[in-house]
């Protein structure tokens, strides 16, 4: 071409009719005018659909690729059963990496880039309808859904997309039910759906399969009041529409079937991308024909990337953008409602949000009020945990009933049968057996069931844990264990147990208002202060006692000798007086001991001057010894008490852990989480982690057996234990104040009523009564200010 001639860029198209080919040529002319054609001139080359795949592939080669087309537009074939007519176009052009722009093709398979590697489209796939369903769920606050999908690529794609969206909202379908495409019997599947709590049914199926589902649903009375049917476009088209129930909500892609509008927008996108592409360097021309040509178009992948990143704001069909799969983003849908066999637009999805027109909607059963979306199951699965005094677990009698017992008030203890592992000790085989549960939480459950009109079956948590998030197989994925895990997985509908309300749990489940306010405290063994019989020896060391004992006898002997042999001893003032006898050895002993033990000596004192001097020195020494001993004895008796009790969470023995002082809590409990989360308690946590117990009962026993010096746990439980087991005592101030709440899933229909019922129970004194009955009654004398007593131990 001459230097001043524009570059000719051929654009190919496979369209439904000659009329559409004419529209395509007009759109190309419009694009040339819009961009100015002095540099680049677009040229339209088109064919209509061929009756079979081989002819279609040949036509693409002979009529389009031979013209060196930069891109090929392809509409969906007019025959509804000939689903894969764009496939030969996609395969043939894709082989050479020539981008293909689908105009009205909605099947999700075309999003698979490993199969359709050069395919983009100006419409979204059917699976993207999941985004609209998800948004409708949000707008109408429907959290309980049943997903009914055909077990084919389309159904699985819709399911995957919806599940991903639900996961982001930390939610999930109550049940996903799959059926084989073309099946004629879905009754059993729908029967299963009917048993569930959810009443919002989302259906993804072909026209014919949808018709089968609707017929079966009508027979099972699943299309009347209370139900919601959310479907896509295929499910309210053709044969499906004949059987669809009134009140169904379906979707229609706005301009979805408007081939001429999509031709216009696709040409606009291609024109914009061509101009962008040709500004880049090293652009090669597309292949000319297929015969003998196996080389890909080198610039093809680059052109596809340019197309995919295009933003065409002023399209006839709205804003045209593509996602990473080449599918149209921000598509607009009409929300259609079947009323009296007619489809009525009752809302819009504008690419991001649903704008409903509630005035126009008629719900199944002719209702004008939005259905709740669930039926409240009145039989609830309750999970609990053995934790006295909140939940006692005892074996059943031989006849399978529970032994009759009475509370401290003389009322019969209310017991319920609860199934659960018969032994929680590690290593022993665990069998699920019926047992008897009773206690604070069981009384509360019975009260709630009565006021809120539900029945229940109680089971003990299988792993014996309250619930923490743990990594799965060292991956980054975390899963809840314990009662939390059972609630979230649907094995339980409600946790009725002393479950601590904390932020981490509250992100995933709904807590009721607290039924018990408490905190953490520390349980230690009560050391009764005792003094042993030999404690009077303690003020002096044994060497000193030995020296004192020796001194007594040495002094006595010295006195005896001095008194016996001193020449002064014989000096008489008055010779008439009878001569006094010198000290005998025994009286010298008597004198020596007497002085030491401070007894008044009436006779047998030394007579000689020298002996008396020694006696005075000894008396002085004795006075010092006795005074020292007395003072020390008093001090020792005062100090002869056990090591000072833990003062609280800030006690140095806790803050500076050592193996001499072992403290712990229960593994994977809220206390465990608390210590793990608090940075300033990290040293404590590292110590505790090594010593934590499987259950509170085991830890309490360990304290009693002196294997554990301190057990950190819920104050309500520990205060109760200390009041029952007289060798235990709680110590220190409460810390990490919290409460126990009843746990429910976020979407639980019971959550408001449970909280209201608990608040009423606080107001009317019921909780106070439970507290008196189960938690606050005393078995032990709580006073611990007795003086040290002497014992024979």
């Amino acid at each position: 071409r001459a230097a001043c001639d524009p570059k000719i860029v051929n654009i190919g198209a496979v369209l439904s009719t000659r009329k559409h080919e004419q529209m395509f040529r007009e759109a190309v002319n419009q694009a040339n005018k819009r961009h100015g054609s002095w540099k680049i001139q677009l040229n339209a080359t088109s064919v209509t659909h061929k009756p079979n795949a081989i002819q279609m592939a040949l036509s693409v080669c002979e009529d389009l690729i031979s013209s060196q087309v930069y891109a090929i537009l392809v509409s969906h074939p007019p025959t509804p059963n000939d689903h894969f007519t764009p496939t030969p176009v996609s395969y043939t052009a894709g082989f050479y990496r020539i981008p293909v722009l689908g105009l009205t093709t909605r099947m999700s398979i075309y999003s698979d880039k490993s199969i359709h590697l050069s395919f983009l489209r100006t419409v979204p796939p059917y699976s993207h309808q999941s985004s609209v369903w998800f948004e409708m769920m949000r707008v109408y606050s429907w959290n309980h859904i049943i997903l009914l999908v055909s077990d084919d690529h389309e159904g699985r794609a819709a399911q995957k997309r919806l599940e991903t969206l639900l996961e982001e909202r930390e939610s999930k379908a109550e049940k996903v039910l799959q059926f084989d495409p073309g099946t004629k019997n879905v009754t059993a599947l729908l029967m299963e759906a009917k048993e569930l709590e959810a009443r919002v049914i989302i259906l993804s199926a072909s026209e014919d399969d949808a018709a089968t589902v609707y017929r079966a649903a009508a027979m099972l009375n699943m299309t009347g009041s209370g139900y919601v049917w959310l479907v896509g476009e295929r499910e309210i088209s053709g044969n499906a529409l004949r059987y669809a129930p009134d009140g169904i909500l379906g979707l229609q892609l706005i301009n979805g079937k408007n081939e001429s509008a999509h031709i216009s927008d696709a040409v606009g996108v291609v024109a914009q991308a061509v101009h962008e592409l040709l500004e880049k360097e090293n652009i090669t021309d597309p292949p000319r024909g297929c015969v003998g040509n196996t080389n890909i178009w080198k610039t093809g992948p680059l052109f596809k990337r340019v197309l995919m990143s295009s933003k065409y704001a002023d399209g006839v069909t709205g804003r045209v953008e593509f996602n990473e799969d080449g599918d149209r983003k921000f598509a607009n849908y009409s929300i259609m409602n079947l009323q009296n066999r007619k489809l009525v637009q009752v809302g819009i999805y504008n690419g991001t949000h649903v704008i409903p027109n509630d005035r126009k909607i008629i719900w199944p059963g002719g209702e004008t009020e939005k259905p709740r979306g669930y039926q409240m199951s009145t039989r609830l699965k309750i999970v609990t945990i053995h934790q006295e005094p909140f939940v006692y677990v005892k074996p059943t009698l031989s006849d399978g009933t529970c032994k009759e017992e009475f509370t401290v008030n003389g009322d019969p203890v209310k017991k319920v049968i609860c199934t659960g592992p018969n032994d929680t000790s590690p290593g022993s085989p665990r069998h699920t057996v019926p047992q008897c549960c009773y206690g604070f939480c069981i009384d509360l459950l019975i009260k709630l069931a009565r006021t809120m009109n539900f029945t229940y079956e109680v089971h003990l948590v299988a792993d014996g844990k309250f619930g923490t998030q743990e990594r799965v197989n060292n991956s980054n994925k975390k899963e809840w264990n314990g009662m939390m895990g059972e609630l979230l997985s649907g094995q339980a509908d409600m946790i009725v147990a002393p479950l601590t309300i904390n932020n981490e749990r509250a992100q995933y489940i709904e807590f009721s208002k607290p039924f018990k306010y408490q905190g953490l405290t520390i349980l230690v063994k009560k050391e009764i202060p005792r003094s042993t019989l030999d404690s009077f020896m303690q003020p002096f060391q044994s060497t000193l006692w030995l020296l004192v004992g020796l001194s007594v006898h040495v002094v006595a002997v010295m006195l005896y000798l001095l008194d016996r042999f001193s020449p002064f001893g014989r000096f008489k003032v008055n010779s008439e007086e009878e001569e006094e006898d010198a000290l005998t050895l025994s009286s010298a002993m008597w004198f020596s001991w007497g002085v030491l033990l401070n007894s008044g000596i009436g006779e047998g004192a030394p007579r000689s001057f020298s002996a008396r001097i020694l006696g005075m020195v000894w008396a002085g020494f004795a006075m010092i010894i006795v005074a020292s001993y007395t003072a020390n004895l008093a001090a020792f008796l005062v100090l002869d008490r056990p090591e000072e009790r833990i003062t609280g969470i800030n006690d140095p023995r806790l803050r500076n852990p050592s193996d001499k002082f072992i403290y712990a809590t229960v593994k994977q409990s809220s206390v465990d989480i608390y210590f793990r989360r608090q940075v300033e308690l990290s040293t404590m946590y590292r110590h505790m982690e090594k010593h934590n117990y499987e259950s509170a009962a085991e830890a309490i026993q360990a304290v009693r057996d002196n294997k554990l010096h301190a057990f950190i746990w819920d104050s309500a439980v520990l205060e109760f234990e200390a009041s029952q087991k007289c060798d235990l005592v709680t110590t220190g101030e409460l810390f990490f104040r919290s409460g126990f709440g009843i746990g429910m899933r976020k979407d639980s229909p019971w959550k408001q009523n449970v909280s209201l019922s608990i608040l009423k129970s606080h107001e009317n004194g019921f909780m106070e009564d439970l507290d008196k009955t189960w938690v606050r009654y005393q078995e032990c004398d709580s006073r611990s200010n007795a003086p040290a007593t002497l014992t024979f131990e």
């Epitope: 009323q339 009296n340 007619k342 009525v344 819009i348 704008i355 027109n357 126009k360």
Partner: antibody
Framework: QVQLQESGPGLVKPSQTLSLTCSVT?????????WHWIRQPPGKGLEWIAY???????DSNPSLKNRVTISRDTSKNQFSLKLSSVTAADTAVYYC????????????WGQGTLVTVSS | DIQMTQSPSSLSASVGDRVTITCRPS??????LAWYQQKPGKAPKLLVY???NLADGVPSRFSGSGSGTDYTLTISSLQPEDIATYYC?????????FGQGTKLEIK
């Protein structure tokens, strides 16, 4: 062919109740569609008053709500409008019309009846 | 309530002229709009529904377009029998409201 025909007194005294009836021929009012009353004061624009649906449910303009009663007589294939406590401002041509709710439009209209409120 | 602002309120055009009447709702009505023609002393007659669809029996010179909050009724070639008042009306929310009307006259 569907036809709608309004009937009722042409003159109503202030504070009294205006009563109008729309007779429908060529289509059963219980089969489908929404059946409306619309009015047009002399020389002014159109104002929607109320509708009754094929299933008997109804709705009316909030600005008139506490004065409007809409009902139907299925045996005569008629629907009626009662507007209480009328004033001179209620003087208008009253039309009945059929709404094709699927296409969101009034596709059939009666020829209208003028009601004057005056003492 | 959604307010419907119609413009112009009146216009004069010659036979064969292209005439456009616009209607602007106070909020998005998502193409839930109808156009009516009312001749003096007569009931209104449906011309266009759902913003762009021509009602049965309406001449093809009438067309509707628009979306969101901007709608247009176009008469491609004005005929003498088109002399009337034209009303737009939304059906999105309750209550459905009408524009104040555009009176079309022949020059």
């Amino acid at each position: 062919q569907v036809q709608l025909q309004e009937s009722g007194p042409g003159l109503v005294k202030p504070s009294q109740t205006l009563s109008l009836t729309c007779s429908v021929t060529g289509y059963s009012i219980t089969s489908d569609y929404y059946w409306h009353w619309i009015r047009q004061p002399p020389g002014k624009g159109l104002e929607w008053i109320a509708y009754i649906r094929y299933d008997g449910r109804n709705d009316s303009n909030p600005s008139l709500k506490n004065r409007v009663t809409i009902s139907r007589d299925t045996s005569k294939n008629q629907f009626s409008l009662k507007l209480s406590s009328v004033t001179a401002a209620d003087t208008a041509v009253y039309y009945c019309a059929r709404e094709d709710y699927a296409s969101s439009s009034f596709d059939y209209w009666g020829q209208g009846t003028l009601v004057t409120v005056s003492s | 309530d959604i307010q419907m602002t119609q413009s112009p309120s009146s216009l004069s055009a010659s036979v064969g002229d292209r005439v456009t009447i616009t209607c602007r709702p106070s909020e998005n009505i998502y193409s839930n709009l109808a156009w009516y023609q009312q001749k003096p002393g007569k009931a209104p007659k449906l011309l266009v529904y759902a913003a762009t669809n021509l009602a049965d029996g309406v001449p093809s010179r009438f067309s509707g377009s628009g979306s969101g909050t901007d709608y247009t009724l176009t008469i491609s070639s004005l005929q003498p029998e088109d002399i009337a008042t034209y009303y737009c009306q939304h059906f999105w929310d309750s209550p459905p409201t009408f524009g104040q009307g555009t009176k079309l006259e022949i020059k």
